[in-house]
Interface confidence: medium
């Protein structure tokens, strides 16, 4: 699986979409999990409704919500009030029994709030103790990176 990068602005909501083959994954519940280290397990954050027919209903765990369009074949995860510690590697999964198929590998990048003067975002330079004023990246951008080309997840 290639990894898709989703960028969101700190304090705002980020929507992550995971398309899948609706026929292949018919009747399967879905889940959103966080990758713990490069080779570590994927820790479940939230999963769709226990009744597959009700998968369209939004389920929440803290600031993370999940909903599944089973006909269209799109799993949508919403991260509310995005924070730097939300940055990292995740997976969208399709569940069957005790097994899980990976639908998409995701890297969430958290960008500083353009109005937040505490962080310089993309104009911060490590060689100076004083940072630039703003962060300047559009809300909710996604792009694909090839395997081996993934930047380290940002840290708080």
């Amino acid at each position: 699986h290639n990894t898709t990068v989703f960028q969101g602005v700190e304090g705002q909501s980020l929507q992550v979409s995971c398309p899948y083959d609706s026929m292949k994954h018919w009747g399967r519940r879905k889940a959103w999990c966080r990758q713990l280290g490069e080779k570590g397990p994927c820790q479940r954050v939230v999963s769709t409704h226990n009744l597959w027919l009700l998968s369209f209903l939004r389920r929440r765990n803290g600031s993370t919500a999940i909903t599944d369009d089973t006909l269209g074949g799109t799993l949508t995860i919403t991260l509310r009030n995005l924070q730097p510690h939300d940055a990292g590697f995740y997976q969208c999964q399709s569940l069957h029994g005790s097994e899980a198929d990976t639908l998409r590998k995701v890297l969430v990048e958290v960008l500083a709030d353009p109005l937040d003067h505490r962080d310089a975002g993309d104009l911060w330079v490590p060689g100076e103790s004083e940072s630039f004023e703003d962060a300047h990246v559009e809300h909710s951008i996604s792009r694909s990176l090839l395997e081996g080309e993934i930047p380290f997840p940002p840290t708080s």
Partner: antibody, heavy 122, light 113 residues
Framework: EVQLLESGGGLVQPGGSLRLSCAAS????????MSWVRQAPGKGLEWVSA????????YYADSVKGRFTISRDNSKNTLYLQMNSLRAEDTAVYYC???????????????WGQGTLVTVSS | DIVMTQSPDSLAVSLGERATINCKSS????????????LAWYQQKPGQPPKLLIY???TRESGVPDRFSGSGSGTDFTLTISSLQAEDVAVYYC?????????FGGGTKVEIK
């Protein structure tokens, strides 16, 4: 698709003034820092100035400090460079560039406009 | 200011052969807090604006062919084109994104032998 289109270049006498503009489209302009980078004919790249997304903070290269002013109008999605007291050594193609974002990524430029040529000569 | 020095000034390489460009910074651009080197590479084809290829010394920008790779740490860096293609004819610039003012190397012109 992100597009940056510079304008305002031309021939100006030493000591004269010129204002460059860069019209941006395809992204939320106010969320991004922007920069000017210049390239003298047949020479390398020289960073000139940068401005934050809100326009509240600016940086300048020593070679232009006090003579050039970077500004932006977020309602018009336009970046400006006011150039005063121009010298022959300011002759260059001036590129407008969008700065990448993200925690920990220092200032890198992507993408760039096609550039506008400023010639300072008597 | 950090001075960036590139070598060679120009390079002629046969199609399919390896091209290697060096860049040296006058002070380290390694940030110890995250162990990243704040060094970027750009490609400028004739009559075009520059294009970002690599940042953090070795992280390829999305869409950049994997024949382009960056390496090095501290003050010494290398851009390698593993198998030169006709479309790689360009001037390549290194840039430090470690401290203001941002500075570029003088450029290396890559041609086909």
């Amino acid at each position: 698709e992100v597009q940056l289109l510079e304008s305002g270049g031309g021939l100006v006498q030493p000591g004269g003034s010129l204002r460059l503009s860069c019209a941006a489209s395809g992204f939320t302009f106010s969320n991004y820092a922007m920069s000017w980078v210049r390239q003298a004919p047949g020479k390398g790249l020289e960073w000139v100035s940068a401005i934050s997304g809100s326009g509240g903070s600016t940086y300048y290269a020593d070679s232009v400090k006090g003579r050039f002013t970077i500004s932006r109008d977020n309602s018009k999605n336009t970046l400006y460079l006011q150039m005063n007291s121009l010298r022959a050594e300011d002759t260059a193609v001036y590129y407008c560039a969008k700065l990448r974002g993200g925690y920990e990524v220092g200032p890198t430029f992507d993408p760039w406009g096609q550039g506008t040529l400023v010639t300072v000569s008597s | 200011d950090i001075v960036m020095t590139q070598s060679p000034d120009s390079l002629a390489v046969s199609l399919g052969e390896r091209a290697t460009i060096n860049c040296k910074s006058s002070q380290s651009v390694l940030y110890s807090s995250n162990n990243k080197n704040y060094l970027a590479w750009y490609q400028q084809k004739p009559g075009q604006p520059p294009k970002l290829l690599i940042y953090w010394a070795s992280t390829r920008e999305s869409g950049v062919p994997d024949r382009f790779s960056g390496s090095g740490s501290g003050t010494d860096f290398t851009l390698t084109i593993s198998s030169l293609q006709a479309e790689d004819v360009a001037v390549y610039y290194c840039q430090q994104h470690y401290i203001w003012p941002i500075t570029f190397g003088g450029g290396t012109k890559v041609e086909i032998k």
